[in-house]
Structures are given as C-alpha cells and as structure tokens.
C-alpha cells in the first residue's frame, strides 16, 4: 500500500510541524491506524500513533505530542514541541485494521527541520 | 505494498515536524497500522505508532511524540519534541492489518531536519 | 439519513434464477463493504459473505460458492446478490447490511420463496 | 469456523427484570491486531437486526444505557438492567474477527 508524505517540513519558530500523510485508496477500510516513526541511521522510533474510524475523527492520546485531523484518505498532522534535535527523518506508516484483509504501508519518510531559535539579547 | 512519503522536511523551531506518509489502494482494508521509525546507520528505533480504522480516528498514546489525521490512503503526520539531534531518516511503516490479508510496506523515508535556533544577541 | 431499501419479495420455481438488490442512500457507498445475510424460516442468521464496494471483490462463505454472486451497480449505490438454479433450501430472508466495524444498518430484508 | 454458542436458547423475563445471554467462541476471538470484533443485535418479529454492542462493550448509536456488554477472549454477555417491553425478540452474538464470520444461534427474550 502507497503512503505519501512531504520530503521536507520546517518546523515553526514554535516548535511545531505540520504535513500530510496520504495513503492510497483506502476503499472499505473501517479502521485506520496511523504512526509516526522517527528514523536516526538505523534506529526507528515511535513518535506517535493513533486510530481513527470512517466515523470518528483522529485521536492522539492525551499527552501526545502529535495532533491531526483526518479528511479521506489524508491525514493531516502537527507535532508540537519540537526542537532542533528532533531534526530528522519521520516516517508516516499506515495501516488499514479493519475489515480483512489487513493493509500496511510506510511512507519514504518527511525530512523535518526544526531550527532552535537564537536566544533574544537582554535588556539593560 | 507501497508507501510514499515526503523525502525531506524541516522542522519547526519548536521542534514540530509534519509530513503525509500515503499507502498503496487499501481495498477494503479497515484497521490499519501506521509506524514511524528512524533509521540511524543500520540501526532502525520506532518512533511511534497508531492504528486506526475507517470509523475511528487516529490515535497515538498519550505519550507519544506524534500526532497526526488521517485521509483516505493519506496520514498527515506531526512529529513534537523534535531535537537537532533527531535529524535523520524516518520511515513510515505501513501495515494493513485487518481483514485478512495482511500487508506491510516501508516507505524510502523523510529526512527531517531539525535546526537549533541561534542564541539572540545581547543588547547594551 | 442512513438507509438500506432492498427489492420486494421474490416467488421462484426450482432452477430459475433471482436476482436482489440493496440500494444505498445516506453515505458514500464506497466506502463501507456490503455483507449479505440470509435467514431461513424459523432459523437463525448465517453470514453468506461479502463485497468490497470499492474494488468490487466479493467474498463468499464455503457455503455459498457456486450459484451465489455478489455484484455492484456503484453508480446506483446498489449492491446486488444473485442466485442462480434455486433450490427449495433457497427459501429465506436475504438481508444486505452495511459493514465498517459492525453491521450498523441493515436493510428491511427480501423474502424468497422457492417451490415448484 | 469459529462457532458462537448463545445460551439459554430462551430467556422467560418479568418486564423490570435484569436479563444475562452468554456468548462462547470455540475459539479466541481476538484479532491480530488487539481488538476482538464481537458485536450484539437484536431481531424483533418480522424485523431486520439492530446492532446494540459493538467491540464487545461499546454501545451503538442511540441504544438505550441499560444495554451493556463484556468479556474477552472466548467467553462473553450481554446483560439488560431492566427489560422492557421494546427488548423482546431475538438477540445474536456475531463474531467478525475470523473469516468466516459466524452468529451465534440466537437466544429469545420473551415474557414470562
């Protein structure tokens, strides 16, 4: 299964990142799961994941650091808190739960940039 | 199965990296499964993971770094607590788990980059 | 709102063919598989299969391979099952119903009967 | 195939009554992926089924709280706190995790 995502985001002087996962046609699916994984030289990581129905819109847990809402076979999604360190390779994977027959795919991977802000000088 | 993604993404200075990760046609795929992993060298560490179906949105734990909505085939993506040092390729891992069959694809993976902020100058 | 309108009862001789249809409203048909289900007198619910709405690929119970055949008219939003070479056992209520994650509307059932 | 056996075959109630169906899969019911699809409806005479519970416990839509289901891995039930005149009829389990999907054969909810 084709998963589409950015090459490249840069982060807001906030922190927070935003891009699409899109995944192809997702025909009956009635459960999608989708995750964020990080990727640094061989090591992946989970950033986040959630699950979301054909009814019932996209949800991070409470103390995610990812938010998104879902439209199709988009998916929209920002993570927040970011920082310079967390540039990096994020892999979007989706997989399509419910019903059989059970459908995964990983997108190539979007290039986020996040760029610590320089500190503001102090007043006298 | 295939899985696009963006190649690169810049995250925002607060450390937040979105990209879109699409799969190939689910077909009648209903729960799906969305891992992001981060590939460092030969070593690969999951950044996060969701599962989510066509009725119910993505959700990622309440601890996880991503948040992220989903569209059809296509998850858009949000990496938070991004560090310079999370630099790298991420790859989205897309798995169509339910019904049967079940599939997986990888995506090529996102070079997300994480730029740390440069200190303000200091007034006098 | 959310409907499943099925055609109205059939009287068939043994060795004939019917064919019944399931028309959908109230969301996009694509998108939820369409199971069919049938009930014998007196019997209880047998699941017979399904078919993808999307791709158009059925699904069908061991029991029900062979003369059975689930088709789509997509630009209708109808789904349809067919069964050829009727057999007095053929007698039932047929059933479509809509599948996500739970059959979550059914249509008002077709009522066969088969007798020479 | 997965069979799904309902017991009692029949259940005599008093409206007011609290009401148990058991459900018994010949086998786990859990899919690969964590969640167990097992679902309740309901079918009234000359009726088409109305789903109640859905994933084993989630309510549907508009079905009244009094509605309320549980278990896990082969064993489950659906229990009515007060039954009404409106939940007589025919309750079914359904188990959607394993093709072929399979009902139980159906237990009657009927007056005493």
């Known amino acids: 299964m084709h998963v589409a995502q950015p090459a490249v985001v840069l982060a807001s002087s906030r922190g927070v990142a935003s891009f699409v996962c899109e995944y192809g046609s997702s025909g009956n699916a009635a459960e999608v799961r989708v995750t964020v994984l990080r990727q640094a030289g061989s090591q992946m990581t989970e950033v986040c994941a959630a699950t979301y129905t054909v009814e019932d819109e996209l949800a991070f847990l409470d103390d995610s650091t990812c938010t998104g809402t879902s439209s199709g076979n988009k998916v929209n999604l920002t993570i927040q808190g970011l920082r310079a360190m967390d540039t990096g390779l994020y892999i979007c994977k989706v997989e399509l739960m419910y019903p059989p027959p059970y459908y995964v795919g990983m997108g190539n991977g979007t290039q986020i940039y996040v760029i610590d802000p320089e500190p503001c000088p102090d007043s006298d | 199965m295939h899985v696009a993604q963006p190649a690169v993404v810049l995250a925002s200075s607060r450390g937040v990296a979105s990209f879109v990760c699409e799969y190939g046609s689910s077909g009648n795929a209903a729960e799906v499964r969305v891992t992001v992993l981060r590939q460092a060298g030969s070593q690969m560490t999951e950044v996060c993971a969701a599962t989510y179906t066509v009725e119910d949105e993505l959700a990622f734990l309440d601890d996880s770094t991503c948040t992220g909505t989903s569209s059809g085939n296509k998850v858009n993506l949000t990496i938070q607590g991004l560090r310079a040092m999370d630099t790298g390729l991420y790859i989205c891992k897309v798995e169509l788990m339910y019904p049967p069959p079940y599939y997986v694809g990888m995506g090529n993976g996102t070079q997300i980059y994480v730029i740390d902020p440069e200190p303000c100058p200091d007034s006098d | 709102q959310i409907q499943l309108v099925q055609s109205g009862p059939e009287l068939k001789k043994p060795g004939e063919t019917v064919k019944i249809s399931c028309k959908a409203s109230?969301?996009?048909?694509?998108?939820?598989?369409v199971s069919w289900v049938k009930q014998a007198p007196g019997k209880g619910l047998r699941w017979m299969g399904w078919i993808n709405t999307y791709s158009g690929m059925p699904t069908y119970v061991d029991d029900f391979k062979g003369r059975f055949a689930f088709s789509l008219e997509t630009s209708a939003s109808t789904a349809f099952l067919q069964i050829n070479n009727l057999k007095n056992e053929d007698t039932a209520i047929y059933f479509c119903?809509?599948?996500?994650?739970?059959?979550?509307?059914w249509g008002q059932g077709t009522t066969l009967t088969v007798s020479s | 195939d997965v069979l799904m056996t309902q017991t009692p075959l029949s259940l005599p109630v008093s409206l007011g009554d609290h009401a148990s169906i058991s459900c018994k899969s010949s086998?786990?019911?859990?899919?690969?992926?964590?969640?167990?699809?097992l679902e309740w409806y309901l079918q009234k005479p000359g009726q088409s089924p109305k789903l109640l519970i859905y994933k084993v416990s989630k309510r549907f839509s508009g079905v009244p709280d009094r509605f309320s289901g549980s278990g896990s891995g082969t064993d489950f039930t659906l229990k009515i706190s007060r039954v009404e005149a409106e939940d007589l009829g025919v309750y079914y389990c359904?188990?959607?995790?394993?093709?072929?999907?399979?009902f139980g054969g159906g237990t009657k909810l009927e007056i005493k």
């Open positions: 359904f188990q959607g995790s394993h093709v072929p999907w399979t």
């Open positions: 086998q786990s019911i859990v899919y690969i992926n964590g969640n167990t699809y």
């Open positions: 109230g969301y996009t048909f694509t998108t939820y598989g």
């Open positions: 119903a809509r599948r996500g994650i739970s059959f979550d509307y």
